[in-house]
Every structure is written in structure tokens, then in C-alpha cells.
Interface confidence: low
């Protein structure tokens, strides 16, 4: 028999051993041109010595076969001998060692068996209903197709799934999603309605990332406020990598998570934009204002859980950057000013409500006045810190207000509002002796000392009735005692004590009346 | 053309069972996946459960932990045990093959049987 043709003799071997768990196997074979074919399959076991013989029997009844070597792959034409219109059932023979093995048969029509290809470009992934939606263009002129998805974990070996029968110009494919760990699949397609044709390549990888994106565990730290106003915000811990399959490691699209920085600048709530998104990797410079960070993961399926985390606002207060001047129109505030054109947000919070929401109010952009300073005014029907309260007055600066990450800390203070002077007299003043010639003289803390950096000094005032003579006595704003000395004995004294704020002169407490008693000896 | 008769529906107090059968007119060895659909009145036809000739099951969350389908190839049938029953799984109950584009079906759907939850 010529070689490129089927020889309808027997075969030089003895009948085949079909029950090995060796041999000829998966089988397939189809058209790759208008007259030509070509058969291929696998041998599982030593191949030293082994010969292959592919044998086919016709409709009629009538066998022959093609003996092929060691190799496992065949070409024919359609003048070989093997009628290519009408069903023809093929097998493997194997021989080696006096021993034949036999691979299962396939019956087909060898000229409508066309090689299928995998699916090719694009495949959508979607969800539905919990599992895994794969769709794709079916391949030009294959149309009606049988599919096999395979589908591996990092930690898992591939496992095999049906798809089902396609009939369409598209083609999909549901499958298992996991909840937790990121997938590889790979698609196959072949004829469909007949069992024996051969299945296409495997498709190139689909990266399939975990349905729940991966908890960000990221750390931040905020550096000190600079002179600037600003601080940044650094990441310590970066998110960690999700873990991929063997065949999506590298550039593989699809299972990526992307990492995003919400920041939410809970201060100065009257501004235009409270929230921004932006990439991890662009770590911002933040003002001294407080905020809520949220690091939001996402994949191909959208948002996943988010870590938030709270950053207070810098305390550090400078007592001495603001001027205050009240006047009978109203109040202005005088800071330092920065940039042409900056607008400022001046916030202010009685002491002690830190949890309900600051009142605030943002200026028109404004350039510096003759003496560099920035200014923002009030009437006194405005109400604003008209209460004679601690308030805590921070300004943020920005020549760029709708940008969130481009404000900075101008000062953060305390101011007490309403009439300080009187608010501020220091009550329960009392006199106790202390020696011959000395008393001690204690009050009721101001309320100005509930501000902190306000009360600059406490002023003791001591008249002696007799002489008129007036002494004054500067105590320390954190001290509410004093001890009057050289005293005279039989004199009649008054004391009166007030309350001193950088800016402001206090009144005077309710005059006290004191002498100490002549000491008349036995 | 493969016939489907389900049966085994009924009325059952709340959190009762029943367990429903599907008998398909020939072999559904090969059919990949298998469903089971309900439609209350008024109402959409929902998806519910589905098995694929391997034994994978899937379920829609309404009635994940409750519902349990499988699948006898030798004996052409598919089933789906329903425990836990609520009201609202008042409906008619129909299997069919399942598709990627649910409610695309290849067969024609079969008459249901109807599963009524009330004390």
C-alpha cells in the first residue's frame, strides 16, 4: 500500500487490547482544507517502540487504515481512499511489544468536521445571579458549537465544565464565581451534534478577579502641620496583592483591583465640595481640618468594602495670629493674610460642642490689605459669637476653593465672644487673714479661662481708704489667689480683681472691703 | 422534542416542605443545565435553582438555604426539595434546560404545578 493512501488490508498486528489504561486516546480529526484532512491524537504511556495505526471503516463496511509510526498526527487528502461525505468510524491502534491498544472510536462526516477555533478577542464577563457570565462573538462561519470551560484557583489545578450547546452569533458560558480568590479561565469550542469531532484550542487566559474585592488593610500616618498649613498623609502599609493564577500573572487585564482615597474634610462644611476621589498613589497634602479617609477597592464587578478611617484635626493653636477688634457697628478679624486672590473659610465652634455641626462662613477671594492683613466682618445682629462663650475660630485658606486638597490651615485660635470685659470679671473674691501685716486674696476662676490662650493675666487691685494709695498686682492666668503684703493694721482696704485678654482690658470686680484688726497685747 | 411534567406541588402550612419532580419525555444525560422557575401571579417569572450534568447547583438568594435541587440522568428527572416555606414562595412552578440568557429556554414549558403557602 502507498503511504499516503488507506490500505484496506489487514493490519500487521493482532486484534487490540481495549481495557489498558495506557494508549491511544482523544482522538479527533477534520477538515483543514477544501480536499484535506488531518487526524491527531494523544498516547498516554512509554513511547519507545509503540506504532501507531489509525484505522477507519466505511459505511459499507469496509476498513482500512494508515499505518503512521511513531507519530501522532496524519494528513490525508480526499483521494486516500476514505469516503469524506459519508460517515466513517476511526480508531487508533497503537502497537508495541507484541501488545495493541485501542483508542475509542469516532464516527463522523469528516467534510462538515471543521477544526473550531477557541473564542477569539473580546470576552465579556459580566455577573448574573451569583455566577460568572462569559459572552463572546462566535468565531466567523461556526456557528453551533458545543463549549468546555476549564477554570483554577492560585491554589487549585483546573477543573473542567460544560457550557452547554450555542447557537448563535454569540456565545456564552455561565459560571462559578468565587467569592474570595481571583480565577483563570479557558474556553473551547467544537462542532456541535457530533461527539467525535475534535475540540478547538484552549482560549487565551480570562482573568477573573474575586466577586467581594479584597479588604484594603492600609495604614496612614499625618505628618506635623507645616508652616505652610499643610500636612501630608502618607500611606505605612501598602494594600496587600491579590493572589493570581498561574496564567494571569503579568499584564493579565480584568482581575487588577484598583485601590481609591476618598477624602471627606469634615471642617468648614460651608465650602463648595466637601468629598474627593483619588488614585492610592497620589497621596495628598491635607489642611489641619479634620477628615474621614476611606479607601474604597474595586474590580471588573464594581466597589467592594471600604476601610474608613478618621483624622482629627491638628489642635495646635497660635494664640497671637488673629486680632480681634469690637467696635459699636460690629466685629472684625484681621490675620495675616497669603496669596492674591485667596478665599478664606473662617469657622467657629463654641467649646465644648465639638460633635454638633460649626458655623462657617467663606469670604469672596481677597487680596492682602496696605498692611498685609486679610479681614472678615460681622455686624453685631448677625449674631455671630455674640454669646459670651469660649468659641474656637480656625481660618483655612485657598486660592483654588472647589479643589479639596489645595486648602491649607491659616490659624486655629480661641476667642471669647459677647462683651468679654464683663463676662470676664473674676466673681467670689474673698480676703482671709494671713499674717500681722498680710492677707490672701482668692476668686472664682474668669470665664475667659475657659479659653484657651485668652486670659492673658489677672490684675489685683488694693486701695488703702485712708491714703487713697492704689497698688496693683499682675498674677499669672493660671493662679486665683494672691497675698497682699505690708498691710497697716486698722486701716481700711479694698480689693477688686479683673480678668486681662491680650487685646482687652477687663472690669473690675465688686470692691471688697478688708482691714486687718490692731493687735492689742495683754 | 423533550417533554417536561413537573409535579409534586400542593398546599403546605409556613414552614413546611414539599419536594417537587420534573420528568423529562427522554434522556437529559447530556443536557447541561437543568432549572427550576416559579411565577406567582402578576408577576415575572423568576429564576430559581439550576444543577449542570456535572452535579453543580446554583440558587437565586431568595431561596439559597432553603431550596435544594438535583438531578437523576438515569431516570430522567429533576428535582427540588423546598423547606422552610415562606408566603411569598406562593407560586407556579415549572422546570426547564437552563440557558446563559435566563428564561431563554430550548423547550416548550410544561403546564407547573402549584405550590400554595397559607396556615
Known amino acids: 500500500c502507498r503511504t499516503s493512501e488507506c490500505c484496506f488490508q489487514d493490519p500487521p498486528y493482532s486484534d487490540a487490547d481495549s481495557g489498558s489504561a495506557s494508549g491511544p486516546r482523544d482522538l479527533s480529526c477534520y477538515r483543514i482544507s477544501s480536499a484535506g484532512y488531518e487526524c491527531s491524537w494523544q498516547y498516554e504511556g512509554p513511547t519507545a517502540g509503540v506504532s501507531h495505526f489509525l484505522r477507519c471503516c466505511l459505511s459499507s463496511g469496509r476498513c482500512c487504515y494508515f499505518a503512521t509510526g511513531s507519530a501522532t498526527r496524519l494528513q490525508f487528502s480526499d483521494q486516500a481512499g476514505v469516503s469524506v461525505l459519508h460517515t466513517v468510524t476511526l480508531w487508533v491502534e497503537s502497537w508495541a511489544r507484541n501488545r495493541t491498544e485501542k483508542s475509542p472510536e469516532v464516527t463522523l462526516q469528516l467534510y462538515k468536521s471543521v477544526k473550531y477555533k477557541p473564542p477569539l478577542g473580546d470576552i465579556k464577563v459580566s455577573k448574573l445571579a451569583g455566577q460568572l457570565r462569559m459572552e463572546w462573538e462566535t468565531p466567523d462561519n461556526q456557528v453551533g458549537a458545543e463549549v468546555q470551560f476549564r477554570h483554577r484557583t492560585p491554589s487549585s489545578s483546573w477543573k473542567l465544565g460544560d457550557c452547554g450547546p450555542q447557537d448563535d452569533d454569540t456565545e456564552s458560558c455561565l459560571c462559578p464565581l468565587e467569592m474570595n480568590v481571583a480565577q483563570e479561565f479557558q474556553l473551547r469550542r467544537r462542532r456541535l451534534g457530533s461527539q467525535g469531532s475534535s475540540w478547538s484550542k484552549w482560549s487565551s487566559p480570562v482573568c477573573v478577579p474575586p466577586e467581594n474585592p479584597p479588604q484594603p488593610q492600609v495604614r496612614f500616618s499625618v505628618e506635623q502641620l507645616g508652616r505652610d498649613g499643610r500636612r501630608r498623609l502618607t500611606l505605612k502599609e501598602q494594600p496587600t496583592q491579590l493572589e493570581l493564577p498561574e496564567g494571569c500573572q503579568g499584564p493579565a487585564p480584568g482581575v487588577e483591583v484598583t485601590y481609591q482615597l476618598q477624602l471627606h474634610m469634615l471642617s468648614c462644611p460651608c465650602k463648595a465640595k466637601a468629598t474627593r476621589t483619588l488614585p492610592l498613589e497620589k497621596m495628598p497634602y491635607l489642611s489641619g481640618a479634620a477628615y474621614n479617609v476611606a479607601v474604597i477597592s474595586s474590580n471588573r464587578f464594581g466597589p467592594g468594602p471600604n476601610q474608613t478611617w478618621h483624622i482629627p484635626a491638628d489642635t495646635h493653636t497660635e494664640p497671637v495670629a488673629l486680632n480681634i477688634s469690637v467696635g459699636t457697628n460690629g466685629t472684625t478679624m484681621y490675620w495675616p493674610a497669603r496669596a492674591q486672590s485667596t478665599t478664606y473659610c473662617i469657622e467657629w465652634q463654641p467649646v465644648g460642642q465639638e460633635g454638633s455641626l460649626a458655623t462657617c462662613n467663606l469670604t469672596a477671594p481677597q487680596d492682602p490689605d496696605p498692611a498685609g492683613m486679610a479681614t472678615y466682618s460681622w455686624s453685631r445682629e448677625s449674631g455671630a459669637m455674640g454669646q459670651e462663650k469660649c468659641y474656637h475660630i480656625t481660618i483655612f485658606a485657598s486660592a483654588h476653593p472647589k479643589k479639596l486638597t489645595l486648602w491649607s490651615t491659616v490659624l486655629s485660635t480661641y476667642h471669647f465672644g459677647g462683651n468679654a470685659s464683663a463676662a470676664g470679671t473674676p466673681h467670689h473674691v474673698s480676703v482671709k487673714n494671713h499674717s500681722l501685716d498680710s492677707v490672701s486674696v482668692d476668686w472664682a476662676p474668669s470665664l475667659l479661662s475657659t479659653c484657651p490662650g485668652v486670659l492673658k493675666e489677672y490684675v489685683v487691685r488694693c486701695r488703702d481708704e485712708d491714703s487713697n494709695q492704689v497698688s496693683e498686682h499682675p498674677v499669672q492666668p493660671t493662679e486665683t489667689q494672691v497675698t497682699l503684703s505690708d498691710l497697716r493694721a486698722g486701716v481700711a482696704y479694698t480689693v477688686q480683681v479683673r480678668a486681662d485678654t491680650a487685646w482687652l482690658r477687663g472690669a473690675w470686680s465688686q470692691p471688697q472691703r478688708f482691714s486687718i484688726k490692731v493687735q492689742v497685747s495683754d | 422534542e423533550v417533554q417536561l411534567v413537573e409535579s409534586g406541588g400542593g398546599l403546605v402550612q409556613p414552614g413546611g416542605s414539599l419536594r417537587l419532580f420534573c420528568a423529562a419525555s427522554r434522556s437529559i444525560f447530556n443536557i447541561n443545565i437543568m432549572g427550576w422557575y416559579r411565577q406567582a401571579p402578576g408577576k415575572q417569572r423568576e429564576w430559581l435553582a439550576s444543577i449542570t450534568s456535572g452535579g453543580s447547583t446554583f440558587y437565586a438568594d431568595s431561596v439559597k438555604d432553603r431550596f435544594t435541587i438535583s438531578r437523576d440522568s438515569v431516570k430522567n428527572t429533576v428535582y427540588l426539595q423546598m423547606n422552610s416555606l415562606k408566603p411569598e414562595d406562593t407560586a407556579a412552578y415549572y422546570c426547564?434546560?437552563?440557558?446563559?440568557?435566563?428564561?431563554?429556554?430550548?423547550?416548550?414549558w410544561g403546564q407547573g404545578t402549584l405550590v400554595t403557602v397559607s396556615s
Open positions: 426547564n434546560r437552563y440557558r446563559s440568557v435566563p428564561l431563554n429556554t430550548v423547550y416548550p
